[in-house]
Interface confidence: low
């Protein structure tokens, strides 16, 4: 599996999408786990609803949510209020029994918020935007980052 990079801005939300073959994974619950070290175990963060037919219902664990479009074949993970410690390697998984197939390996990168970067030499003009906190994400603007694309640069 290649690793797909998703970048988000600190303090914003990042949406990670994991496409899969809906027929091949029919009836299977999904999970989002964090890789502990290069060859370590993948620690479960959150999984879809216990009833597969209700997989579309968003489930939260802390600031992480998961929802599964089982017909369209897209698992979506939302990391809310992204923080530097959220950066790291993750996996989208398809569960069957005690086994788990990797749907996608994901590298989450957390960037400073370019739109809310204040610096002695370059002040923002808050009057222009009520909350830069909602602004986009740096390299990759928060919300959802396109695979391989690096959205925002910072501004200090």
């Amino acid at each position: 599996h290649n690793t797909t990079v998703f970048q988000g801005v600190a303090g914003q939300s990042l949406q990670v999408s994991c496409p899969y073959d809906s027929m091949k994974h029919w009836g299977r619950r999904k999970a989002w786990c964090r890789q502990l070290g290069e060859k370590g175990p993948c620690q479960r963060v959150v999984s879809t609803h216990n009833l597969w037919l209700l997989s579309f219902l968003r489930r939260w664990n802390g600031s992480t949510a998961i929802t599964d479009d089982t017909l369209g074949g897209t698992l979506t993970i939302t990391l809310r209020n992204l923080q530097p410690h959220d950066a790291g390697l993750y996996q989208c998984q398809s569960l069957h029994g005690s086994e788990a197939d990797t749907l996608r390996k994901v590298l989450v990168e957390v960037l400073a918020d370019p739109l809310d970067h204040r610096d002695a030499g370059d002040l923002w003009f808050p009057g222009e935007s009520e909350s830069f906190e909602d602004a986009h994400v740096e390299h990759s603007i928060s919300r959802s980052l396109l695979e391989g694309e690096i959205p925002f640069p910072p501004t200090s």
Partner: antibody
């Protein structure tokens, strides 16, 4: 692929307002990134004017702050530039561009020439 | 604002030659996160600027490897190892480390 297209009047009278539209296809302006206006004066000098981010936040070049407004119509996937009280100094080719963070301005429109003249 | 100073303003070259363009910023372009947001664009006659190099030294997709970028802090260089006819145009450096994004004045690469 993402495409940006500027449109608007090519001639504006001094003291009036300049209004341009950037129509984006192939990507939703509410998904990510910052959507910018940049202008190029005769002689090639480029000036960043401002942007509206996917969330609707705006940031403007301080040199234009009192005259500029960037807004959007998410239903049409368009964003707009309004520059008030124009003078002949505002004659330029106006570009809209998507700011991709690490990549800077990776996608540009083809530009539209606006002449300010009586 | 951060002032970007490009030299030379005009660069006459022969096809196949190496070309070098310098860009200097009035303040450091190293962002608080450690990245340096200095980019290079090429504008061919009648076209909009196109991204060549991002973050100092990374070639954008589809950009030939004869283009290379280097530098740090406030001093940056774009090099073209073997100039081809399609490389002619105006080159701009630009910074997006600081909120008011700024561009260099441009360097026109032309045939000697």
């Amino acid at each position: 692929d993402v495409q940006l297209q500027e449109s608007g009047p090519g001639l504006v009278k001094p003291s009036q307002s300049l209004s341009l539209t950037c129509t984006v296809t192939g990507y939703s302006i509410t998904s990510d990134y910052a959507w910018n206006w940049i202008r190029q004066f005769p002689g090639n000098r480029l000036e960043w004017m401002g942007y509206i981010s996917f969330s609707g936040s705006t940031s403007y070049n301080p040199s234009l702050k009192s005259r500029i407004s960037i807004t959007r119509d998410t239903s049409k996937n368009q964003f707009f530039l309004q520059l008030n009280s124009v003078t002949t100094e505002d004659t330029a080719t106006y570009y809209c561009a998507r700011w991709n963070g690490n990549y800077g301005f990776a996608y540009w429109g083809q530009g539209t020439l606006v002449t300010v003249s009586a | 604002d951060v002032v970007m100073t490009q030299t030379p303003l005009s660069l006459p070259v022969s096809l196949g030659d190496q070309a070098s363009i310098s860009c200097r910023s009035s303040q450091s372009l190293v962002h608080i996160n450690g990245n340096t947001y200095l980019h290079w664009y090429l504008q061919k006659p009648g076209q909009s600027p196109k991204l060549l190099i991002y973050k100092v030294s990374n070639r954008f997709s589809g950009v030939p490897d004869r283009f290379s970028g280097s530098g740090s802090g406030t001093d940056f260089t774009l090099k073209i190892s073997r100039v081809e006819a399609e490389d002619l145009g105006v080159y701009f450096c630009s910074q997006s480390t600081h909120v008011t994004f700024t561009f260099g004045s441009g360097t026109k690469l032309e045939i000697k």
